[in-house]
Interface confidence: low
Amino acid sequence: VEVQVSEDPVVALVDTDATLRCSFSPEPGFSLAQLNLIWQLTDTKQLVHSFTEGRDQGSAYSNRTALFPDLLVQGNASLRLQRVRVTDEGSYTCFVSIQDFDSAAVSLQVAAPYSKPSMTLEPNKDLRPGNMVTITCSSYQGYPEAEVFWKDGQGVPLTGNVTTSQMANERGLFDVHSVLRVVLGANGTYSCLVRNPVLQQDAHGSVTITGQPLTF
């Protein structure tokens, strides 16, 4: 028996369902009574789900996994993972045994989009050209860690005096706070771009300083 999985990682959004595809080519006359199927975490060797003795033995992993019972006889050994969490990320191995045995691993990449950044300014009044200001760009609840870019009004990257911190919450999602310290010109627009490297999703925030008032 030959087991096939997708070579590319499966990307799943947090709290959605993901399908880890695995297939084999059944011989003519194949019946489910012959099939032994195991899904296992590749790294920790933990059992995730199994099918044997002609029946689904059920989930051994958070009760959030399921097979596609009607498709098994056609050689579809895919695993459905429900309500994906950050901790589900990793490699899963699909083992299939009929008379002989084969296995293959598929990677699950978990992702969550970052929120539109909120911008804060310190100080936020009595600003004069030549003042040093601190602009903070905050974006929340994303995964994996973000890439943060700052640009001025002309699109020129600002790389000096930038400090970015990312903290994971109890669900493993990241809140990102990036601080730009800059000397004000007469007028200025400062843009922050928070990029999710897996989703290739960009979240933009900007602040324009034109004397008074401020525009966010």
């Epitope: 032994n36 060797k45 933990q46 044997t52 033995q57 051994a60 045994s97 045995f101």
Partner: antibody, heavy 121, light 107 residues
Framework: QVQLVESGAEVKKPGSSVKVSCKAS????????ISWVRQAPGQGLEWMGR????????NYAQKFQGRVTITADKSTSTAYMELSSLRSEDTAVYYC??????????????WGQGTLITVSS | DIQMTQSPSTLSASVGDRVTITCRAS??????LAWYQQKPGKAPKLLIY???SLQSGVPSRFSGSGSGTEFTLTISSLQPDDFASYYC?????????FGGGTKVEIK
């Protein structure tokens, strides 16, 4: 709590075969691997091979390939290890072991009591 | 096959001593290493898995460390019940292999 109970000690002649049984209770027998590990008197531990009953397949250490056969009967939750062409250096305590409900096929939380096989003419 | 080399083969120590046993793999095994304790006439008992994870029910005086090819088992304060033989086992690849063992005896 998984329990593994092995068959009793045996004395065998060189060139003969021996079959040791290991009955499991208290766990999901078919889902987890049963390994066989032996220990010659005063020596260290030596992994011989394993069977994953749920898959119905066995893997063997190269050293024992062709001489050892590991099987499992899911209906009785019993694993068997048969070693053929016995020689004096096969005198050892033979253990069955598994990972229990930790789902590990590779480390051993639970062990049988051991079966002493003596090969002597 | 991956060779596992333990040292020392015998170690004499007293109750209360801090004891360290070393295990070396012939090639990198990441952290796929377990430690077992065995008393005469008894089956081995799993102490540590994945190099440093303490098996449930094992006293906290036992700890494991290391990754790659170099690993240690430490008993922070040796107790009378700890005089036994100790084995490391790699499970990075088949065949699973054990170290030759370290006997911890009373000084």
């Amino acid at each position: 709590q998984v329990q593994l109970v092995e068959s009793g000690a045996e004395v065998k002649k060189p060139g003969s075969s021996v079959k040791v049984s290991c009955k499991a209770s208290g766990g999901t027998f078919s889902s987890y691997a049963i390994s066989w590990v032996r220990q010659a008197p005063g020596q260290g531990l030596e992994w011989m091979g394993r069977i994953i009953p749920i898959l119905g397949i066995a893997n063997y250490a190269q050293k024992f390939q062709g001489r050892v056969t590991i099987t499992a009967d899911k209906s009785t939750s019993t694993a068997y290890m048969e070693l053929s062409s016995l020689r004096s250096e096969d005198t050892a305590v033979y253990y069955c072991a598994n990972g229990g409900d930790s789902s590990s096929w590779y480390t051993f939380d639970y062990w049988g009591q051991g079966t002493l096989i003596t090969v002597s003419s | 096959d991956i060779q596992m080399t333990q040292s020392p083969s015998t170690l004499s120590a007293s109750v209360g001593d801090r004891v360290t046993i070393t295990c070396r793999a012939s090639q990198s095994i990441d952290n796929w290493l377990a430690w077992y304790q065995q008393k005469p006439g008894k089956a081995p008992k799993l102490l540590i898995y994945k190099a440093s994870s303490l098996q449930s029910g094992v006293p906290s005086r036992f700890s494991g460390s290391g990754s790659g090819t170099e690993f240690t088992l430490t008993i922070s304060s040796l107790q009378p019940d700890d005089f036994a033989s100790y084995y490391c086992q790699q499970y990075d690849s088949n065949p699973l292999t054990f170290g030759g063992g370290t006997k911890v005896e009373i000084k």
